[in-house]
């Protein structure tokens, strides 16, 4: 019995269906086929869980969190024992193993391993201003998303004709900050932060209005 090499890893957007491949070759009839799918969750590597089991011609549910979401992609018994996971959740990320036995066929590699990564688009970020908006002050524009896998990067733009930040601005696309030094009337305007990762983007808006000192009445 020989389980085929798997592609290594599968990536899927949260809520979509993941297909985890596993196929084998055997010299025996599929009368005593036994397939166990296990997962080592990324969030809890010390607690492997059973995903689904095929034994004695019957399918059995694994861990409660997979109930109703998991099944074999084809009619069992078969040499293709790939599974699907519907409505993928962040907690489904982990290393999945298919363990195949088909007596009396012995020997060979009977385990296949596939990594699953559930990707999450960035949630709409929060846009904030740190610092005084008085003329000549330094301000920091802050942008961060609560969710996003892979971790989002952040791009700030000023929504005028150029989409360019003021010349006194420095941007950190990893931290999501823009520091604008010595703000002037030209710094005023609407700014948009775009949070993006491999599977999506989201935005927030921030209105910066520089406050000029009121002329003193004599």
């Amino acid at each position: 019995l020989e389980v085929s090499e798997s592609p290594g890893s599968v990536q899927v957007a949260r809520g979509q269906t993941a297909v985890l491949p596993c196929a084998f070759s055997t010299s025996a009839a599929l009368l005593n086929l036994n397939v166990i799918w296990m997962v080592i969750p990324l969030s809890n590597a010390n607690q492997p869980e059973q995903v689904i089991l095929y034994q004695g011609g019957q399918m059995f549910d694994g861990a409660l969190r997979f109930h109703g979401r998991v099944g074999f992609t084809g009619t069992m018994p078969a040499t293709n024992v790939s599974i699907f996971i519907n409505n993928t959740q962040l907690s489904d990320t982990g290393t999945y193993q298919c363990l195949v036995n088909n007596l009396p066929d012995r020997g060979g590699r009977n385990i296949g391993v596939t990594g699953l990564t559930v990707l999450v688009p960035p949630s709409a970020p929060q846009c904030q201003i740190q610092g005084s908006q008085d003329l000549g002050s330094d301000v920091i524009l802050l942008c961060s998303s609560e969710e996003g896998i892979p971790r989002p990067t952040y791009l700030w733009e000023k929504l005028d004709n150029t989409l360019k930040l003021p010349p006194t601005a420095t941007q950190d696309q990893v931290q999501g900050t823009v520091t604008i030094r010595n703000i002037s009337a030209l710094s005023s305007g609407l700014y948009q932060c775009v949070a993006s990762n491999a599977i999506g983007t989201s935005t927030c808006l921030l209105d910066l209005q520089v406050i000029s000192p009121q002329p003193r009445s004599v």
Epitope: P121, S188, Q209
Partner: antibody, heavy 121, light 107 residues
Framework: EVQLLESGGGLVQPGGSLRLSCAAS????????MSWVRQAPGKGLEWVSA????????YYADSVKGRFTISRDNSKNTLYLQMNSLRAEDTAAYYC??????????????WSQGTLVTVSS | DIQMTQSPSSLSASVGDRVTITCRAS??????LNWYQQKPGKAPKLLIY???SLQSGVPSRFSGSGSGTDFTLTISSLQPEDFATYYC?????????FGQGTKVEIK
């Protein structure tokens, strides 16, 4: 009491121009960004343009960019929309709307009653 | 641009009914969502801002919920003056965009 009163709507030929005005009262006009929103007959709402409280920053929907100009006169508490190169698809009721202050940019908290602009030959 | 999709586009209900209107954004918009009511021949009126905050002067039978991409406007007990068209609007990104509207009619 916040009040927004429009004027300037009417019938205009395709390619023509029109200027809408919106007189504001009941609040410190220069402290608020203002906007124009339109609604074609029997259709939904479409944001058209916005301007910051100082008038230094202006924003437009792609559908009107280069043809419409938003402006304001804070000494007169009045918002304007200059509409040039008008097309049949610009036919709509035009509303001026006040935007909530600060971090709530983009929330229209008070609206005018609307003025109808009809572009037809 | 962020697309806003409302459902249903129209509904018939009776006075006293509980009415629910949903709005879905094409991308996550956090809580940057507003709801407006518009009666025929009138200007829109702000009902709910920031997805769930009731605008001053709006009756408490109106409530909003949701975050991310899915939002709901609920009228707990429909009153005669509530028959109107309702619009959701996002302020997460530019351009500002509205849903196509939901018309609430008398059954």
């Amino acid at each position: 009491e916040v009040q927004l009163l429009e004027s300037g709507g009417g019938l205009v030929q395709p390619g023509g121009s029109l200027r809408l005005s919106c007189a504001a009262s009941g609040f410190t006009f220069s402290s608020y960004a203002m906007s124009w929103v339109r609604q074609a007959p029997g259709k939904g709402l479409e944001w058209v343009s916005a301007i910051s409280g100082s008038g230094g920053s202006t924003y437009y929907a792609d559908s009107v960019k280069g043809r419409f100009t938003i402006s304001r006169d804070n000494s007169k508490n009045t918002l304007y929309l200059q509409m040039n190169s008008l097309r049949a698809e610009d036919t709509a009721a035009y509303y001026c709307a006040r935007m909530a202050a600060g971090a709530s940019w983009g929330t229209f908290d008070y609206w005018s009653q609307g003025t109808l602009v009809t572009v037809s030959s | 641009d962020i697309q806003m999709t409302q459902s249903p586009s129209s509904l018939s209900a009776s006075v006293g009914d509980r009415v629910t209107i949903t709005c879905r954004a094409s991308q996550s918009i956090s809580s940057y969502l507003n709801w407006y009511q518009q009666k025929p021949g009138k200007a829109p009126k702000l009902l709910i801002y920031a997805a769930s905050s009731l605008q001053s002067g709006v009756p408490s039978r109106f409530s909003g919920s949701g975050s991310g991409t899915d939002f709901t406007l609920t009228i707990s007990s429909l009153q005669p003056e509530d028959f109107a068209t309702y619009y959701c609007q996002q302020r997460s990104g530019s351009p500002l965009t509205f849903g196509q509207g939901t018309k609430v009619e008398i059954k």
